[in-house]
């Protein structure tokens, strides 16, 4: 299996009740606006074939895509949560900047690409769905990167 390095986040990043609540609130607000409940972005298909030792690297890719292609373009929506949550997630992304995999990561990129394609295909509703799954993104980062 490919070896991942520097793919760790300190536990303290997830021990801040205020920003945790704001992240969950943002997800909840967006999920109320999500009419397509049959599609799941962060779930079994995303994780398929990816071992736990590679999972943090996978979630780093998802985090970066979510920030650049979803949260930044939608930054004027879902206030006041968005203005607090985006900088927090951006800090997590920065702390994972040196997280990489030595070896073949094609299976990971394939799974991430499917997520990206789904979001793009759904257009704005795909972006809303991604925001509505920020609680799952948060929990997946916590689960994989600590």
């Amino acid at each position: 299996a490919p070896i991942s390095s520097h793919c760790r986040l300190d536990k303290s990043n997830f021990q801040q009740p205020y920003i945790t609540n704001r992240t969950f609130m943002l997800a909840k607000e967006a999920s109320l606006a999500d009419n397509n409940t049959d599609v799941r972005l962060i779930g079994e298909k995303l994780f398929h074939g990816v071992s736990m030792s590679e999972r943090c690297y996978l979630m780093k890719q998802v985090l970066n895509f979510t920030l650049e292609e979803v949260l930044f373009p939608q930054s004027d929506r879902f206030q006041p949560y968005m203005q607090e949550v985006v900088p927090f997630l951006a800090r997590l992304s920065n702390r994972l900047s040196t997280c990489h995999i030595e070896g073949d990561d094609l299976h990971i990129q394939r799974n991430v690409q499917k997520l990206k394609d789904t979001v793009k295909k759904l257009g704005e509703s795909g972006e809303i769905k991604a925001i509505g799954e920020l609680d799952l993104l948060f929990m997946s980062l916590r689960n994989a990167c600590i």
Epitope: F14, F24, M25, G43, M52, R55, M139, I146
Partner: antibody, heavy 121, light 110 residues
């Protein structure tokens, strides 16, 4: 076939300690978060504690925090619950439970048969 | 500790549809993206029947469906059958990373 087998239950006096074990087989143990859930006789389900794949995060119900410690040994495919300062209200059947899919331990799709803990003087 | 409230009992005739509610306080921030439902027959271990609000594990009958609205999640059993007589529990991951179960609902098939 996924199998979870709990052991270590028994009768203990208030203030005493017990260590529960859960032996897992039939799946890649270190790909999954794990949980302990309990059920007092004739009562509902109560989540006790959960741990992620590598033991990096350990979460507890308020009722057991500071008294119980969850741990895992991936080399032995085993989950543990160290229970200290036991109280009468800890009397229950203790289940070991695995997440339905890897990455979401809170969806408990596989359960053991449980081990009974009785706290009584 | 967050609390999820379920009706203590619900009943219906064979072939009918019934719905079990699971309500949390408004302060249970964001919890309802993580709702799961369990079926437990007397003397048996719990069985996951719905996860992530509305997803069904493989092997679970499509007569079981989950949904949510606001702070209330719901489990609907359509085409009620005798074997559906059981206890049903909702559960949710909440924002302090603990999992909270509802008190359980006893379903009786008349």
């Amino acid at each position: 076939e996924v199998q979870l087998v709990e052991s270590g239950g028994g009768v203990v006096r208030p203030g005493g300690s017990l260590r529960l074990s859960c032996a897992a087989s039939g799946f890649t143990f270190d790909d999954y978060g794990m949980n302990w859930v309990r059920q007092a006789p004739g009562k509902g389900l109560e989540w006790v504690s959960g741990v992620n794949w590598n033991g990096g995060t350990r979460d507890y119900a308020a009722s057991v925090k500071g008294r119980f410690t969850i741990s895992r040994d991936n080399a032995k495919n085993s989950l543990y619950l160290q229970m200290n300062s036991l109280r009468a209200e800890d009397t229950a059947l203790y289940y070991c439970a695995r997440g339905w899919y890897s990455g979401a331990a809170w969806n408990m799709g596989y359960w053991g048969r449980g081990t009974l803990v009785t706290v009584s003087s | 500790q967050a609390v999820l409230t379920q009706p203590s009992s619900v009943s219906g005739s064979p072939g009918q549809s019934i719905t079990i509610s699971c309500t949390g306080a408004s302060g249970d921030v964001g919890a309802y993206n993580f709702v799961s439902w369990y079926q437990q027959h007397p003397g048996k271990t719990p069985k996951l029947i719905i996860y992530d609000v509305n997803k069904r594990p493989s092997g679970v009958s499509n007569r079981f469906s989950g949904s949510k609205s606001g702070n209330t999640a719901s489990l609907t059993i359509s085409g009620l059958q005798a074997e559906d007589e059981s206890d049903y529990y909702c559960a949710s991951l909440v924002s302090d990373f603990s999992v909270v179960f509802g008190g359980g609902t006893k379903v009786t098939v008349l």
